[in-house]
């Protein structure tokens, strides 16, 4: 993500918002420049707390964070729908909350990856997230930004539903990716990525165990368990939606 934005006193813009903000981007637009935990209320949704990351590129909502293995991510559909974890630590915001933020708009999805040697990678995608009636399908609406190639995720235009061990929507007929790996994810063929996999502090010897880890195949490889991941989303302006 771009560097931190310059601070602006929110008091200057108080008159511009007479309700809770819809999302972190709207917060940014009315002058907020501090990152942190905020209460938002997307249209038609009850209020909830989100981590906002304010950058020179606007306000981003953090939808996932992993860094220490303190939270179990191997959870059923309802947990991934509602969200779980600690907003000050590791968490999954919740598919329904994310969808209430994005609505029918296209969004930018930023994925931050870190390995155990201190190397970091930032990927950005243009995506569209469907509602529960589509199993929260994630569709790439533009090519991947970065050097990792389109094999990291489904090709542009392909829509991949979200899967958990108890709700198998992956693109493999012969396998339940969430069950054979770990956690809930937009599984295509089980082998491209899984940022909600099991957290390993040390690399297990058995490959069978290793495949359950947190990985992004085209960065550090299929069997390299990542040290930290963060996912952030930013809805685009309504007119940018397809």
């Amino acid at each position: 993500l771009p560097e931190m934005a310059q601070p602006v006193d929110p008091a200057h813009n108080v008159s511009r918002l007479h309700r809770l903000p819809r999302d972190c981007q709207e917060l940014f637009q009315v002058g907020e420049r501090q990152s942190g935990l905020f209460e938002i209320q997307p249209q038609g949704s009850p209020p909830f707390l989100v981590n906002c990351k304010m950058t020179s590129d606007g306000g981003w909502t953090v939808i996932q964070r992993r860094h220490d293995g303190s939270v179990d991510f191997n959870r059923p559909w309802e947990a991934y729908k509602a969200g779980f974890g600690d907003p000050h630590g590791e968490f999954w915001l919740g598919l329904e909350k994310v969808h209430s933020i994005t609505g029918d708009r296209n969004s930018r999805l930023a994925v931050q990856l870190r390995d155990w040697d201190g190397n970091a990678e930032l990927l950005q995608f243009s995506v569209h997230l469907g509602g529960e009636d589509t199993a929260y399908s994630l569709q790439l609406t533009a090519p991947v930004a970065g050097q990792l190639g389109a094999t990291t995720v489904p090709p542009s235009g392909l829509s991949v539903p979200f899967s958990t061990w108890d709700q198998d929507h992956d693109l493999r007929r012969d396998k339940n990716c969430a069950k054979s790996l770990s956690g809930g994810w937009w599984f295509g063929t089980c082998s491209h990525s899984n940022l909600n996999g099991q957290y390993f502090r040390s690399i297990p010897q058995q490959r069978q165990k290793l495949k359950k880890g947190i990985f992004w195949k085209t960065w550090r490889g299929r069997y390299y368990p990542l040290q930290a991941t963060t996912m952030l989303i930013q809805p685009m302006a309504a007119e940018a939606a397809s």
Epitope: L20, E39, I40
Partner: nanobody, 124 residues
Framework: EVQLVESGGGLVQAGGSLRLSCAAS????????VGWFRQAPGKEREFVSI????????DYADSVKGRFTVSRDNAKNTVYLQMNSLKSEDTAVYYC?????????????????WGQGTQVTVSS
């Protein structure tokens, strides 16, 4: 400019109760997170409790958890701090503070507006 006025402080015996109020002069009060802080003589100001603009989320310092309850009535532009089972170590000046747009923070540096404070004294 948002004005905050605390009331409800006073002298109470240990084990007793008090209800503090924080009244705000702002039309869009439901968009403000409100925090309660306190400062005992010779000590630094410390976080007590917080409530979001909608009243949906709150949080407490470990030292008051289970004894204090924060609530709000946005129609009356007021936040309340119900303090039960008071102890002598609760003696302090209690301040309410507000932060626009619902930032959920325990840090006093994150609040734009402050009241003048109300004294709470608990005698043992």
């Amino acid at each position: 400019e948002v004005q905050l006025v605390e009331s409800g402080g006073g002298l109470v015996q240990a084990g007793g109760s008090l209800r503090l109020s924080c009244a705000a002069s702002v039309l869009t009060f439901g968009t403000y997170t409100v925090g309660w802080f306190r400062q005992a003589p010779g000590k630094e100001r410390e976080f007590v409790s917080i409530i979001t603009g909608s009243g949906t989320y709150n949080d407490y310092a470990d030292s008051v958890k289970g004894r204090f309850t924060v609530s709000r009535d946005n129609a009356k532009n007021t936040v309340y701090l119900q303090m039960n089972s008071l102890k002598s170590e609760d003696t302090a000046v209690y301040y309410c503070a507000a932060r626009h747009w619902g930032m959920f923070s325990r840090s006093e540096n994150d609040y734009n507006y402050w009241g003048q404070g109300t004294q709470v004294t608990v005698s043992s």
